[in-house]
Interface confidence: medium
């Protein structure tokens, strides 16, 4: 219960704080747990006890290991234990999962993601920002204090947010960098009766003979990641693939989120050399969800080639 | 009549990895497949789910990255494979589809397979 578990990067400040809380008038005794042996006080040390605070500066990965801290008052004493681990900077930018402090939501109304751990540090702003290992740059992201403000979240702001700043201790620096996960959750996700925004209602698509033609279904579906929704084609009634006509194929496009939020999905039909009797067919674009099912028909007709030299 | 069987839950301990399958029977055509759950006293919730048309998958952000959703046209099969399991994920695991059945579009759901995740 009174362990606390602490990490951190060789040659970085790193500053673990005794889990058991006293009044700041009681004296606190660090150890270091395999040993017994006492940690120094004095300042000169790279790894010396301040209070309530066992500071590393830097931290080595031989560090590493269970300190003890013993809060110690006129009528008790309380034992507490900082389980220390000091890793190797990796090489690449992935951050492993042991590295990570606790993830953090974020949605359109609140987006503060704050650095982990940064209050028992001496750091003066601006603090820096990654996102992926990536500087974050743009008027949408503002480091404010101790956190990151993300204007606008969208779901593509989602990933592992890296701060770091800079630690002073008697004129010295130290690096310190730390980083959590965020997700975004949709606050206003809703999902709804499909709404066909393409083609129109009983709409006259103009093609071709002997040309290829590309026919669009589009539909929305609701504002947020839309689960089960469908977008497709019918050839008189009759689904494609069993149409049996091999010229007349439909293929998954692009998805799309619309900057009102939509979450859309569109099928494209493709015909390859117009023939006359594919005027003669009805062509239905279908969206379905768990609401149900929205039909817009559309019918082809005949494009008289235009004569440029009339 | 549309069937849709689901398999792969048991209890698995925390960090560990089950896949769910689900199968749809007396369809002629799935259009597009997904895992919901549902823990004790929850909302149901959306896992992930994937078109058959394009294979686009969807996921729930608390799964992504450790669950991946896939599926056999052939078969008319969804796999959900879960990885990284954590206790929160402990649910019912419901399958669902829009599929045509018989000239009729529809969507349906299976009786579910409950996944425990525990030490």
């Known amino acids: 219960k009174f362990s606390k578990q602490s990490w951190g990067l060789e040659n970085e400040a790193l500053i673990v704080r005794c889990p058991r809380q006293g009044k700041p008038s009681y004296t606190v005794d660090w150890y270091y747990s395999q040993t017994n042996k006492s940690i120094p006080t004095q300042e000169r040390n790279r790894v010396f006890a301040s209070g309530q605070l066992l500071k590393f500066l830097p931290a080595a990965v031989a560090d590493s290991g269970i300190y003890t801290c013993i809060v110690r008052s006129p009528t008790f004493n309380r034992t507490g234990y900082a389980n220390v681990t000091i890793y190797k900077k990796q090489s690449d930018c992935n951050v492993p999962d042991y590295l990570m402090y606790s993830t953090v939501s974020g949605s359109e109304k609140n987006s503060k993601i704050y650095c982990p751990t940064i209050d028992l540090y001496n750091w003066t702003a601006p603090l820096e920002w990654f996102k992926n290992c990536q500087a974050l740059q743009g008027s949408r992201y503002r480091a404010h204090k101790s956190f990151l403000v993300i204007d606008n979240v969208m779901t593509e702001d989602a990933g592992d947010y890296t701060c770091k700043f800079i630690h002073n201790e008697n004129g010295a620096n130290y690096s310190v960098t730390a980083t959590r996960s965020f997700t975004v959750k949709d606050e206003q996700g809703f999902s709804l009766f499909p709404v066909i925004g393409a083609p129109a209602q009983n709409e006259i698509k103009e093609v071709e003979i002997g040309k290829n033609a590309n026919l669009t279904c589009s539909a929305c579906f609701g504002k947020g990641t839309q689960f089960l929704a469908a977008v497709l084609w019918q050839l008189n009634g009759t689904k494609i693939t069993d149409f049996g006509e091999p010229r007349i194929q439909q293929e998954e496009g692009q998805n799309q989120s619309f900057s009102n939020g939509l979450a859309c999905l569109d099928m494209v039909l493709r015909i390859a050399d117009v023939k006359e009797e594919d005027l003669l067919l009805q062509y239905d674009c279908l969206a379905l969800n768990l609401h149900g099912l929205r039909r817009h028909t559309v019918r082809l007709s005949r494009k008289n080639p235009i004569d440029h030299h009339s | 009549e549309v069937q849709l069987v689901e398999s792969g839950g048991g209890l698995v301990q925390p960090g560990g990895s089950l896949r769910l399958s689900c199968a749809a029977s007396?369809?002629?055509?799935?259009?597009?497949m997904g895992w919901f759950r549902q823990a004790p006293g929850k909302e149901r919730e959306s896992v992930a789910s994937?078109?058959?048309?394009?294979?686009?998958?969807y996921y729930a952000d608390s799964v992504k990255g450790r669950f991946t959703i896939s599926a056999d046209n052939s078969k008319n099969t969804a796999y959900l494979q879960m990885n990284s399991l954590k206790p929160e994920d402990t649910a019912v695991y419901y399958c669902?589809?829009?599929?045509?059945?018989?000239?009729?579009?529809?969507?349906?759901w299976g009786q579910g397979t409950l996944v425990t995740v525990s030490s």
């Open positions: 669902a589809a829009i599929a045509h059945e018989e000239g009729v579009y529809r969507w349906d």
């Open positions: 994937i078109s058959w048309t394009g294979g686009t998958t």
């Open positions: 007396g369809l002629t055509t799935v259009y597009t």
